[in-house]
């Protein structure tokens, strides 16, 4: 009795959905009452399917309402675990254990990343010095550095601070500011550069003709 996995590594975005699969041998018909399926992650029980039904009482609270075994797939010889609204804490090594006549288990790794895609921006001006303060802020994982550039591709020196997000413990809140003397319609770019997996997200900031008071604020979506 051997379980097979088509993938032993899944990479998914924060807030997205993932379905991890373990395949097991099945005859032309499946006897649900002889099938045992366990899905676990480290010390957390996610799925315990015994005697044709899931025992939700044993499910770890962090997976409540988010994890389910796709029952229709069992008849195709697939123990498919679906996790919705994926969190950073879901990352880790999952184990599927299947008992069906024989018994076997396999390990699958889930990696979760959060792109710095939703970039908020703000432009303000010092009425005395006429210096503009450009600000970009986004949340993501893992940490990112912010690179400021001008429309003529000059790299500019900004100041970046990284704090923990209020939304989720492991998420990073990255804020970067650039102080610069600029003229109306000049264009600047803030690029959130993240490693592992490598991904760049850029927002464009256009200096307005005339800044109202207080400073204008808009959110830029990639």
């Amino acid at each position: 009795f051997t379980i097979t996995v088509s993938k032993d590594l899944y990479v998914v975005e924060y807030g997205g959905n993932v379905t991890m699969e373990c395949k097991f041998p099945v005859e032309k018909q499946l006897n649900l009452f002889a099938l045992i399926v366990y899905w676990e992650m480290e010390d957390k029980k996610i799925i315990q399917f015994v005697n044709g039904k899931e025992d939700l009482k044993v499910q770890h609270s962090s997976y409540s309402q988010r994890a389910q075994l796709l029952k229709d797939q069992l008849f195709l010889g697939k123990a498919a675990l679906q996790i919705t609204d994926v969190r950073l804490q879901d990352a880790g090594v999952y184990c599927c254990l299947i008992g069906y006549g024989g018994a076997d288990y396999k390990r699958i790794t889930l990696k979760v990343h959060a792109p710095y895609r939703n970039i908020s921006q703000r432009i303000s001006v010092d009425p005395v010095t006429s210096e503009h303060e450009l600000m970009c802020q986004a949340e993501g994982y893992p940490e990112a550095e912010v690179i400021w550039t001008s429309s003529d591709h000059r790299v500019l020196s900004g100041k970046t601070t990284i704090t923990n997000s209020n939304r989720e413990e492991k998420l990073f809140n990255v804020t970067s500011t650039l102080n610069i003397n600029a003229t109306a319609n000049e264009i600047f770019y803030c690029t959130f550069q993240r490693s592992g997996p490598e991904e760049n997200n850029t927002a464009e900031l256009v200096i307005p003709e005339r800044l109202p008071v207080p400073a204008s604020e808009r959110t830029h979506f990639m």
């Epitope: 009795f1 051997t2 097991f24 041998p25 099945v26 005859e27 032309k28 018909q29 499946l30 006897n31 009452f33 002889a34 045992i36 015994v50 254990l97 008992g99 069906y100 006549g101 024989g102 018994a103 076997d104």
Partner: antibody
Framework: EVQLVESGGDLVKPAGSLRLSCVAS????????MSWVRQAPEKGLQLVAW????????SYANAVKGRFTISRDNAKNTVYLQMNSLRAEDTAMYYC????????????WGQGTLVTVSS | SYVLTQLPSVSVTLRQTARITCGGD??????VYWYQQKLGQAPVLIIY???SRPSGIPERFSGANSGNTATLTISGALAEDEADYYC???????????FGGGTQLTVLG
């Protein structure tokens, strides 16, 4: 080499008890379901009891339900058949058989142990 | 419960083709297994999943399964093939195993 060796067969009086054992070697015992299949003299094969490799799911022939109990000790690579309230019609050669990995078939069989129920 | 029907005996001339049948309601929708049992010995699995042969089983043994009948074919039967042959399927997979009554094959000549 896969080997299954049964023992415990004997001559026993009606209403008596017996415990059959089957010691397995040559494979990862805890990964396979195991069964007891019997064959009465000059008769065909009949599945007596089945036990899953994991979590101890069991199944019995209607003729033995409530009288026979199948169990396994994965640490000892052994499967047992506890037979109570024996009847004359339980007289048979009892074979221990290995499940063929998630299938209903049996890919290896022991040589059998004879149980005779007679007064 | 599920019933598998086999003819009690079948004869074949040496090196001719023997066909042993196993009847069951919609048996084609289930997997069928075949065992050979020689006198005084334990059964041996010779066909699984309708038509697959375990390693070490000669190519002259083949299986088919459709509709209400599964068939074991021995192409060019030898004297050593003289034995009882049992088909096996299930009512419920795994836990509901059912055997046919067995067919005694006699090889003549």
């Amino acid at each position: 080499e896969v080997q299954l060796v049964e023992s415990g067969g004997d001559l026993v009086k009606p209403a008596g008890s017996l415990r059959l054992s089957c010691v397995a070697s040559g494979f990862t015992f805890s990964s396979y379901s195991m069964s007891w299949v019997r064959q009465a003299p000059e008769k065909g094969l009949q599945l007596v009891a089945w036990i899953d490799a994991y979590a101890g799911v069991t199944s019995y022939a209607n003729a033995v339900k409530g009288r026979f109990t199948i169990s396994r000790d994965n640490a000892k690579n052994t499967v047992y058949l506890q037979m109570n309230s024996l009847r004359a019609e339980d007289t048979a050669m009892y074979y221990c058989a290995r499940g063929q990995g998630g299938r209903s078939s049996f890919d290896y069989w022991g040589q059998g142990t004879l149980v005779t129920v007679s007064s | 419960s599920y019933v598998l029907t086999q003819l009690p005996s079948v004869s074949v001339t040496l090196r001719q083709t023997a066909r042993i049948t196993c009847g069951g309601d919609s048996i084609g929708s289930k997997n069928v297994y075949w065992y050979q049992q020689k006198l005084g010995q334990a059964p041996v699995l010779i066909i699984y999943d309708d038509s697959s042969r375990p390693s070490g089983i000669p190519e002259r043994f083949s299986g088919a399964n459709s509709g209400n009948t599964a068939t074991l074919t021995i192409s060019g039967a030898l004297a050593e093939d003289e034995a009882d042959y049992y088909c096996q399927s299930y009512d419920i997979p795994l836990t509901g195993t059912v055997f046919g009554g067995g067919t005694q094959l006699t090889v003549l000549g």
